[in-house]
């Protein structure tokens, strides 16, 4: 994935959660937060932007409560003392449900948006520079964290059942004579246009000269198999696409496909009957020569959730599960626009996709 | 090209129930909120209600709310506003619109509009 | 609810007269202000966006400013196409998350 300079995101971390941001907070960075907030247990949740782990030194302490009608506790805390409450006496989050909720740092305030909407902003009391953290706590499910600097464009993965919490990225192609073991390294800078998470259809909508549109998704969508939907200006280097889901318990295969008109330029393929993780590409209905290699045992198990990540770039796919890059697929079909139609099938539960 | 085409608008009796419908072209129902807006003959524009299918969430204003429900489908790419116990003071015009809400790629701020509108779809409620 | 008044509801202008209508919010909503242009029988267009940002393919004439919670459309010579009634929208969160002013219908005089 290319996140334009970006710190890559944290996928569904565990709460509570502490998180290191990258370079500190800067005029300019928006980081989103996307959630469920839990039905059951507790009347509160928390995100606090602060220096270091120990909780004394809160910049912005943003802490909904399910108290009184509901409310929204806006605060800062120095050197363990808490200051006024400001306090906005409308609830826009919801019990059971999740919630898009977006921090945006100027020079002046925090600016705040949930759902889509300004919910509030908040007048920096303490330099935002001395920030370094971001932590989340309460009654509060997560299913990312994400980092937007200035004058890049958003991508945000939402895995909310992937089992791992840190930035995930592919190495990095070989530069000079040193490479990288494989495993999870920054990723490439590179321009990122639109995303979009959904549930049957993608295709993001353009409002202004260089768009931003934020990913959607609807809430626990039931995902009809085989999913298809289409992937707007089709491939393109630096164009991500992400999916979790659970293998179901007797699964023997699944697939997913990314295929322009009647071709699959890419049918990677998932086989628990050969505990085989099997790539190919059909052209004219006429398969090429099967690809299997895996730099570790199969990713996938029966019964357990995953997610996969695949970028495009200019010469290959790079295909990583779990947070862990897996494997290279270099392009067979080479006019990427034209690889614009996503398929999924077989034996998985899908919980989101990313286009 | 972005479309909205808003449909099934008509005549109902106070009480009674329409389903207005907005089918979008040119983008997803998903990729931004969506909002209804009416506008009563000879007033102005009131906002009715919106949906965030990020995150599911909806809103709608006080005088409708109980009544109508907003909803999509994205199989469909439509949204749909069930509009039930109809009254006189609901005939209006309504209109669907996305509604965009994203940080600027170009600067550090957020911006928000209304960029699409349908052309509207009349519901008359008269006995 | 906040509340966005919009003066004056009506105003009687001339081609190339410098045009200002004005909406007042009850309480501060940030820079989360669009203005719209409607035309009898049409749908609403979006002119500015974020208070003070001109949407793309409307023409430089128009303008929108915002000072506390006052907000500004200037049209600073008005064209024969601008005579049409004019919204201010609020999108800061409250128990109505969006509202609307009462319009400015811009009259040939």
């Known amino acids: 994935m290319a996140f334009s300079g970006s710190q890559a995101p944290y996928l569904s971390p565990a709460v509570p959660f502490s998180g290191t941001i990258q370079g500190g907070l800067q005029d300019g960075l928006q980081i989103t937060v996307n959630g469920t907030v839990l039905s059951s247990s507790g009347t509160r949740f928390a995100v606090n932007f602060q220096t270091g782990f120990s909780g004394n030194d809160i910049a912005f302490h943003f802490n909904p409560r399910f108290e009184d009608g509901g409310y929204v506790v806006c605060n800062t805390r120095q050197n363990g003392s808490w200051g006024p409450e400001e306090r906005k006496t409308h609830m826009p989050f919801q019990k059971g449900m999740p919630f898009d909720l977006c921090f945006l740092v100027q020079s002046s305030d925090f600016k705040v948006m949930v759902n889509g909407i300004l919910f509030v902003q908040y007048f920096h009391r303490v330099p935002f520079h001395r920030v370094d953290t971001i932590s989340v706590n309460g009654s509060v499910q997560l299913s990312y964290i994400s980092f937007q600097n200035p004058r890049t464009v958003p991508v945000q993965p939402a895995f909310s059942t992937v089992p791992f919490s840190q930035p995930v990225c592919f190495p990095p192609r070989p530069r000079g004579r040193r490479q990288k073991p494989p495993g999870v390294w920054p990723a490439n800078p590179a321009p990122i246009t639109q995303t979009v998470i959904h549930t049957v259809q993608s295709a993001p909508g353009q409002m202004f000269s260089t768009p931003a549109i934020p990913p959607m998704m609807y809430p626990h969508p039931a995902y009809p198999m085989p999913f298809i939907t289409t992937i707007l200006g089709g491939l393109y280097p630096s164009k991500s696409i992400l999916l979790s889901g659970t293998v179901l318990p007797s699964a023997q295969r699944f697939h997913i496909n990314l295929c322009s008109g009647n071709h699959i330029a890419f049918h990677l393929n998932p086989r628990f009957d050969e505990n085989a993780v099997v790539r190919n590409t059909q052209i004219d209905n006429s398969w090429g020569s099967e690809e299997r290699s895996l730099p570790r045992k199969m990713p996938f198990v029966r019964g357990q959730s995953f997610s996969v990540w695949i970028l495009c770039e200019a010469h290959c796919l790079k295909v990583a599960v779990d947070g862990q890059h897996l494997f290279e697929y270099y392009h067979r079909l080479r006019n990427l626009p034209t690889i614009n139609r996503l398929e999924v099938g077989g034996d998985i539960q899908l919980t989101h996709v990313q286009t | 090209e972005v479309q909205l085409v808003e449909s099934g608008g008509g005549l109902v009796q106070p009480g009674g129930s329409l389903r207005l419908s907005c089918a979008a072209s040119g983008f997803t129902v998903s990729s931004s909120s969506i909002h209804w807006v009416r506008q009563a003959p000879g007033k102005g524009l009131e906002w009715v209600a919106y949906i965030y299918p990020y995150s599911g969430y909806t809103s709608y204003a006080d005088s409708v709310k109980g009544r109508f429900t907003i909803s999509a489908d994205t199989s469909k790419n439509t949204a749909y506003l069930q509009m039930n116990s109809l009254r006189a003071e609901d005939t209006a015009v309504y209109y669907c619109?996305?509604?965009?809400?994203?940080?600027?790629?170009?600067?550090?701020?957020?911006?928000?509009?209304?960029?699409?509108w349908g052309q509207g779809t009349l519901v008359t409620v008269s006995s | 609810d906040i509340q966005m008044t919009q003066s004056p509801s009506s105003l009687s202008a001339s081609v190339g007269d410098r045009v200002t209508i004005t909406c007042r919010a009850s309480q501060s909503v940030s820079s989360a202000v669009a203005w719209y242009q409607q035309k009898p029988g049409k749908a609403p267009k979006l002119l500015i966006y974020?208070?003070?940002s001109l949407y793309s393919g409307v023409p430089s004439r128009f303008s929108g400013s915002r000072s506390g919670t006052d907000f500004t459309l200037t049209i600073s010579s008005l064209q024969p196409e601008d005579f049409a009634t004019y919204y201010c929208?609020?999108?800061?969160?409250?128990?109505?998350?969006?509202?609307f002013g009462q319009g400015t219908k811009v009259e040939i005089k």
């Open positions: 974020s208070a003070s």
């Open positions: 929208q609020q999108s800061y969160y409250d128990s109505n998350p969006i509202t």
């Open positions: 619109a996305r509604y965009s809400t994203y940080s600027s790629s170009s600067s550090s701020k957020w911006v928000w509009g209304m960029d699409y």
